[in-house]
Interface confidence: low
Amino acid sequence: TAATQQDFFTPNLFLKQMLERYQNNSPPNNDDQWKNNGVTKTWDRLMLQDNCCGVNGPSDWQKYTSAFRTENNDADYPWPRQCCVMNNLKEPLNLEACKLGVPGFYHNQGCYELISGPMNRH
């Protein structure tokens, strides 16, 4: 089926917000910080609860300019640690393997496909 305008805009809006605000510790002004904190908490919760990473997948953090990339060295954090597979203590199962992109140690699925199903039913 043809992509609708809604199909096009919704993930892009999510992506823009995530890239702009996630872990952005140098906002345009102090008043904007609470928005960034809220977005960061929401994304952390989403990625941990739904075992997903970014909007379309871990490559979001590699492909696009982001506040996260500004704040974090690519070698140390190719993607947020919330993208890693966690143990029951909510700690990465193997942080190094996650950072290296070893299958099974990081979440390869984007969060949008997991949450768009429930959203599109309404």
Partner: antibody
């Protein structure tokens, strides 16, 4: 070309309310904060507040908390400033200005409207 | 609220002269996250809206002549015009762009002899 077009001059009675508009062209107000600034004759600039048109969130200077209400209509790319319980102290030129935002990059108030003159007189 | 104090309130100079004006904030405008000072300078000519000159205390907005220079850090800031031109006749405002409310200074009125 980026422009902010403000509504025309207003002459209003004390105690009344007035609603000023600021229509953007050349950019989407969802990608900016829209600020409002007051300039009284022979006095300096006073910052009133801002709106994030993406979600309608507003922030006001404490002095204007009970005086001003900022709203936005993204479908018409327009921001509004409503001033209530007008007195002679509200006689001033009111400017709208934009602060662009994207990927956490900082922008100052780079584009301003031409200003709307409000005169409060019986 | 952060109080912005500008001095002098007005000054009269001859074209070609160097001019400096001061802006002091009651609290530091340095953002420790990126080591930038959130201090902005605007120029307002009679009958016109303010025009952005300098942001981050020292970064010139594109299109602004290089005779305008901003300097300073923390609470003390300066705007310098290296060689004043007739078209620089205006009021110059500094603004705290660090925290709500984003207060302006009272302005420095520049007049040309």
């Amino acid at each position: 070309e980026v422009q902010l077009q403000q509504s025309g001059a207003e002459l209003v009675r004390p105690g009344a309310s007035v609603k000023l508009s600021c229509t953007a062209s050349g950019f989407n107000i969802k990608d900016s904060f829209i600020h409002w600034v007051k300039k009284r004759p022979e006095e300096g600039l006073e910052w009133i507040g801002w709106i994030d048109p993406e979600d309608g969130e507003t922030k006001y200077a404490p002095k204007f908390q009970d005086k001003a209400t900022i709203t936005a209509d993204t479908s018409s790319n327009t921001a509004y400033l409503q001033l209530s319980s007008l007195t002679s102290e509200d006689t001033a030129i009111y400017y709208c200005a934009r602060r662009e935002r994207f990927y956490g990059i900082y922008y100052a108030l780079d584009y301003w409207g031409q200003g709307t003159s409000v005169t409060v007189s019986s | 609220d952060i109080v912005m104090t500008q001095s002098p309130s007005s000054l009269t100079v001859t074209a070609g002269e160097k001019v400096t004006m001061s802006c002091k904030s009651s609290q530091s405008l340095l953002n420790s996250g990126n080591q930038k000072n959130y201090l902005t300078w605007y120029q307002q000519k009679l009958g016109q809206p303010p025009k952005l000159l300098i942001y981050w205390a020292s970064t010139r907005e594109s299109g602004v002549p290089d005779r305008f220079t901003g300097s300073g850090s923390g609470t003390d800031f300066t705007l310098t015009i290296s060689s004043v031109q007739a078209e620089d006749l205006a009021v110059y405002y500094c603004q705290n762009d660090y925290s709500n409310p984003f207060t302006f200074g009272s302005g420095t009125k520049l007049e040309i002899k």
